[in-house]
């Protein structure tokens, strides 16, 4: 796969993953009421990172935000933090990768700079994906623990108004947001890895510049404004080249062996 394609695909995959991380973070269905083996209730409960909701059989849905920070479980706070860190890193990764894309020309940025930026964005995407996966997994683990705890004492005594009240404990299971988060985190991670792989292809390789020969007939030596000679060698790069008027930028028809001066 060519460097441009690998980089572009990595960017797109990361972008889709990043969008998924945002979606998962905002979704209300991180945990949903377990309906299996429970009396059929006309009320369905589900919870997100930011609010909990109740949907009645009548069709009315009521959501209440968690308007406290101190009263929330530490694990929930940790999951929130991980998801937000993942989003922030993803935003930075996207901004960096836009400038790093090989198909976008910005000023006189050479490939070594683009390679560094591609690597940076790749690492940011990898960390972003890992944050999302860890966040979702921590929440899932919390759910599993609570599920089995509430299963152990399915019918618990609960102090209500005027003594002991028999209550069927509401058990929660994995909501759609967890699956969205896992997939999104995985995609962001894969996209980041692809960006890092693309970075290796962008890094200038000394072997490409050992022999410099000229394709021009006669003394027609093309100079770049900076004074560097254009590498149009016959060696390993004997493919059709296009000579551009405005300096000696050459561009491969297939971008498998980019040269140092492919893009200004």
């Amino acid at each position: 796969m060519s460097v441009t394609a690998c980089q572009g695909l990595g960017f797109v995959v990361s972008l889709i993953g990043f969008a998924g991380i945002i979606a998962a973070t905002c979704m209300d269905q991180w945990s949903t009421q377990d309906l299996y083996n429970n009396p059929v209730t006309a009320v369905f409960n589900y919870q997100g990172l930011w609010r909990s909701c109740v949907r009645e059989s009548s069709g009315f849905t009521e959501c209440r935000g968690y308007f406290t920070l101190l009263g929330l479980p530490a694990m929930l706070q940790a999951v929130r933090a991980l998801m937000i860190v993942g989003i922030v890193l993803g935003v930075i990764g996207i901004l960096v990768s836009i400038f790093a894309l090989k198909c976008i020309r910005i000023g006189s940025m050479d490939d070594s700079a683009k390679a560094k930026m591609t690597l940076t964005s790749g690492i940011l995407f990898i960390i972003s994906g890992i944050c999302a996966i860890i966040g979702v997994s921590v929440f899932a683990n919390m759910l599993v623990t609570n599920f089995w705890m509430s299963t152990a004492n399915m019918y618990s005594g609960m102090g209500g108004m005027g003594g002991m009240v028999q209550t069927v404990q509401t058990r929660y299971t994995f909501g759609a947001a967890l699956f969205v988060g896992w997939v999104a985190g995985g995609l962001t991670l894969i996209g980041g890895v692809m960006m890092c792989i693309a970075c290796r292809g962008l890094t200038p390789d000394d072997s490409n510049f050992k022999a410099v020969s000229y394709h021009a007939s006669g003394q027609n030596v093309a100079y770049r404004p900076g004074g560097f000679k254009a590498s149009t060698g016959f060696g390993s790069n004997t493919r059709n080249k296009k000579i551009y008027d405005g300096g000696a930028r050459t561009e491969d028809d297939e971008q498998s062996h980019p040269t140092k001066y492919d893009y200004v």
């Epitope: 059929v40 209730t41 006309a42 909990s52 909701c53 009240v165 209550t167």
Partner: antibody
Framework: QIQLQQSGAELARPRASVKLSCKAS????????ISWVKQRPGQGLEWIGE????????YYNENFKGKATLTADKSSSTAYMELRSLTSEDSAVYFC???????????WGQGTLVTVSA | DIVMTQSPSSLTVTAREKVTMNCKST????????????LTWYQQKPGQPPKLLIY???TRESGVPDRFTGSGSGTDFTLTISSVQAEDLAVYYC?????????FGGGTKLEIK
């Protein structure tokens, strides 16, 4: 103003079937849930089931499965309940009611009296 | 099915008297998700359909006089009429609105002396 208009009284033979209607007006019928409630003369209230008119889903009281069939026609904003294999036990007033907050029934039809007699 | 038990089955009171009727369910009607009790109170006058008085155990329906008050949580609920009026002559039903199938209590018949 929200109204539920039910069909007129029915006199039916044992083992026959009747189809009761409940026409809704004054609100968007398709986004609502309509329940049916039975009340035998001088007795209490019994919930038969409910129709989710937006998706056609229905929930039945197990005691009425096989006895009542709930349907709805969105175009005419009308809910239907068919009662089959009628016996004297089915002689009652049948109400339709619209679900409200807390799964309560805020709006009721005037009731349809079904009399099963040989 | 959830069984709703109402007591007393009938009450005879004088006008402007305070009345209390009870409703007990076999399982808690409290939903942990929103901390609301899914219990409803209805008033049914002779020859009429039931009328919604209270939902969520204590929320008064709009248009219902404030002399009607619902209270209780879990399995034990109460409907209080602070000052009975002649027009309050009716049968009062409580309803489980939490578990399928929805079930009603047997009713409390309120009579005025």
């Amino acid at each position: 103003q929200i109204q539920l208009q039910q069909s007129g009284a029915e006199l039916a033979r044992p083992r026959a079937s009747v189809k009761l209607s409940c026409k809704a007006s004054g609100y968007t019928f398709t986004s609502d849930v309509i329940s049916w409630v039975k009340q035998r003369p001088g007795q209490g209230l019994e919930w038969i089931g409910e129709s989710y008119l937006r998706n056609g889903n229905t929930y039945y009281n197990e005691n009425f499965k096989g006895k009542a069939t709930l349907t709805a026609d969105k175009s005419s904003s009308t809910a239907y309940m068919e009662l089959r294999s009628l016996t004297s036990e089915d002689s009652a007033v049948y109400f339709c009611a619209r679900s409200y907050y807390g799964n309560s029934f805020a709006y009721w039809g005037q009731g349809t009296l079904v009399t099963v007699s040989a | 099915d959830i069984v709703m038990t109402q007591s007393p089955s009938s009450l005879t009171v004088t006008a402007r008297e305070k009345v209390t009727m009870n409703c007990k369910s076999t399982q808690s009607l409290l939903n942990s998700g929103n901390q609301k009790n899914y219990l409803t109170w209805y008033q049914q006058k002779p020859g009429q359909p039931p009328k919604l008085l209270i939902y969520w155990a204590s929320t008064r329906e709009s248009g219902v006089p404030d002399r009607f008050t619902g209270s209780g949580s879990g399995t034990d609920f109460t409907l209080t009429i602070s000052s009975v009026q002649a027009e309050d002559l009716a049968v009062y039903y409580c309803q489980n609105a939490y578990y399928y199938p929805f079930t009603f209590g047997g009713g409390t018949k309120l009579e005025i002396k």
